[in-house]
């Protein structure tokens, strides 16, 4: 649980996130647990340990190794390990089972590939997307944010699939690949306008100044694989991404389905340090699918 | 320096309900983790339940599920457990105590407890 | 239910002594594990965490190890006030678990 296996190409950028998890107020020190030699922070080497996260830019195959992160709360220590492998890049199109992360399944109805690890990079779209090394092309291929769309999916859109994209760290660009399998499973399921389960529109969060919160923005969207189910966070009708504040951010949309079968989306805003400007705001939960938009709005108060 | 102090403790007829609290102070309440853990006379302790430290989301003991809820508020750093339903086997001490790790989908040990109030339930 | 199971129930032994105290997991808990001391008429009291690290200002001569499904606890040399009940606990999921516990009392 708390010795996670991470791999990457030679020349490549890898971030590895430490497996052992805290708050984002803990201190985590990293280290070489072969020579137990402490990672720098500065940013001007090639390896760095920054917070949570151990980045190599870019990676080298002498890297390889077991990489110790040690998370300091105020009275407890918990340590983490992360086992890095660098390869040496193909030479040709075949993709190693060692360099492939999780197979995914799709049917007709749902057919999202996601990009493999690249929550931690600082990426900006579109993807790359490549079938068994080929560029996909033609208009049955969307790249969406951090996944591939595709549409009227056949029995022989199975295969490796692999994510191309830049990672940017402090001006300099760094490419970073990816590959995972695609199965094509037929599914019977339904689609729904969305359901929003939370937060009750119009509803009111007591907040404490200064202190941490969450909102979580949770939807259905029918039963079984969906293809197009989005939920995000709005600020005063502005996307995340365009309300230039570093204290409100986003998470990815977790995929949830229950056990009666509702395949449903939990996306999660976090506000650190509230302050009293984000009372003035306005949160929509937005959920989204190819049957029409639905829109909660919930707001904050002083405790 | 962090303490807990419960009450609401005490002798209760099978069926009637109780309502304990456990008042923190010494840390910043609001963000931790807070459990209830039980330990019937003579016995070993048994966890009861657990809120995480934004209020949300709650976890149960089968033993106790549909008949106990875990609460808080952090206005006034106090934890509370609502007891409905009482049977005789859910005579314990009830201590309160708290997680210092506190992330959301992982648990970690107590590193603070109570002096533990006493709930008898008997006829 | 991860079902942790303490052995010996009770130790019996002189003070100065060496105290091993055992806990098994029915399932792998990696070293998510902790052990606890409770003394009559008092609250728990947390020893050691993730299995073999000691929490803020317990002695030395308390220390863990293991991981996976089998646990031990070891005090090097029992001083007087270490004679009480142990209990060790798993937190790797809910419903978060205890052993039912090892006597240490003196011989």
């Known amino acids: 649980k708390f010795s996670k296996q991470s791999w990457g190409l030679e020349n490549e950028a890898l971030i590895v996130r430490c497996p052992r998890q805290g708050k984002s107020s803990y201190i985590v020190d990293w280290y070489y647990s072969q020579t137990n030699k402490s990672i720098p922070t500065q940013e001007r080497n090639r390896v760095f340990a920054s917070g949570q996260l151990l980045k190599f830019l870019p990676a080298e195959v002498a890297d390889s190794g077991i990489y110790t992160c040690i998370v300091r709360s105020p009275t407890f220590n918990r340590t983490g390990y992360a086992n890095v492998t660098i390869y040496k890049k193909q030479p040709d199109c075949n993709v190693p089972d060692y360099l492939m992360y999780s197979t995914v399944s799709g049917s007709e109805k749902n057919s999202k590939i996601y990009c493999p690890t690249i929550d931690l990079y600082n990426w900006t779209a579109p993807l790359e997307w490549f079938k068994n090394c080929q560029a996909l092309q033609g208009s049955r291929y969307k790249a969406h944010k951090s996944f591939l769309v595709i549409d009227n999916v056949m029995t022989d859109d199975a295969g490796d699939y692999t994510c191309k994209f830049i990672h940017n760290e402090n001006g300099a660009n760094y490419s970073v690949t990816a590959t995972r399998s695609f199965t094509v499973k037929d599914e019977q399921g339904f689609s729904l306008f969305p359901v929003i389960r939370a937060p009750a529109h119009n509803e009111t969060k007591e907040v404490e100044i200064g202190e941490n919160t969450n909102l979580t923005c949770s939807a259905c969207f029918g039963k079984g694989a969906q293809f197009l189910a989005t939920v995000q966070w709005q600020l005063n009708g502005n996307k995340i991404t365009d309300f230039s504040e570093p204290r409100i951010q986003q998470e990815e949309g977790q995929n949830q389905s229950f056990s009666n079968g509702l395949a449903c989306v939990n996306t999660v805003l976090r506000i650190a340090d509230v302050k009293e400007e984000d009372l003035l705001l306005r949160y929509d939960c937005l959920a989204l699918n190819l049957h029409g938009l639905r829109r909660h709005t919930i707001r904050l108060s002083r405790k | 320096e962090v303490q807990l102090l419960e009450s609401g403790g005490g002798l209760v007829q099978p069926g009637g309900s109780l309502r304990l609290s456990c008042a923190a102070s010494g840390f910043t309440f609001s963000i931790y983790d807070m459990i209830w853990v039980r330990q019937a006379p003579g016995k070993g302790l048994e966890w009861v339940s657990t809120?995480?430290?934004?209020?949300?989301?709650?976890y149960y003991a089968d033993s106790v599920k549909g008949r106990f809820t875990i609460s808080r508020d952090n206005s006034k750093n106090t934890l509370y457990l609502q007891m409905n339903s009482l049977r005789a086997e859910d005579t314990a001490v009830y201590y309160c105590?708290?997680?210092?790790?506190?992330?959301?989908?992982?648990?970690?040990?107590?590193?603070?407890w109570g002096q533990g109030t006493l709930v008898t339930v008997s006829s | 239910e991860i079902v942790l199971t303490q052995s010996p129930a009770t130790l019996s032994l002189s003070p100065g002594e060496r105290a091993t105290l055992s806990c098994r997991a029915s399932q792998s808990v990696d070293d998510d594990l902790a052990w606890y001391q409770q003394k009559p008429g008092q609250a728990p009291r947390l020893l050691i965490y993730d299995a073999s690290n000691r929490a803020t200002g317990i002695p030395a001569r308390f220390s863990g190890s293991g991981s996976g499904t089998d646990f031990t606890l070891t005090i090097s040399s029992l001083e007087p006030e270490d004679f009480a009940v142990y209990y060790c606990?798993?937190?790797?999921?809910?419903?978060?678990?205890f052993g039912q516990g090892t006597k240490v009392e003196i011989k």
């Open positions: 606990q798993q937190y790797i999921t809910a419903p978060l678990t």
């Open positions: 809120i995480r430290g934004e209020g949300g989301s709650t």
């Open positions: 105590a708290r997680d210092p790790w506190s992330t959301e989908g992982s648990f970690f040990v107590l590193d603070y």
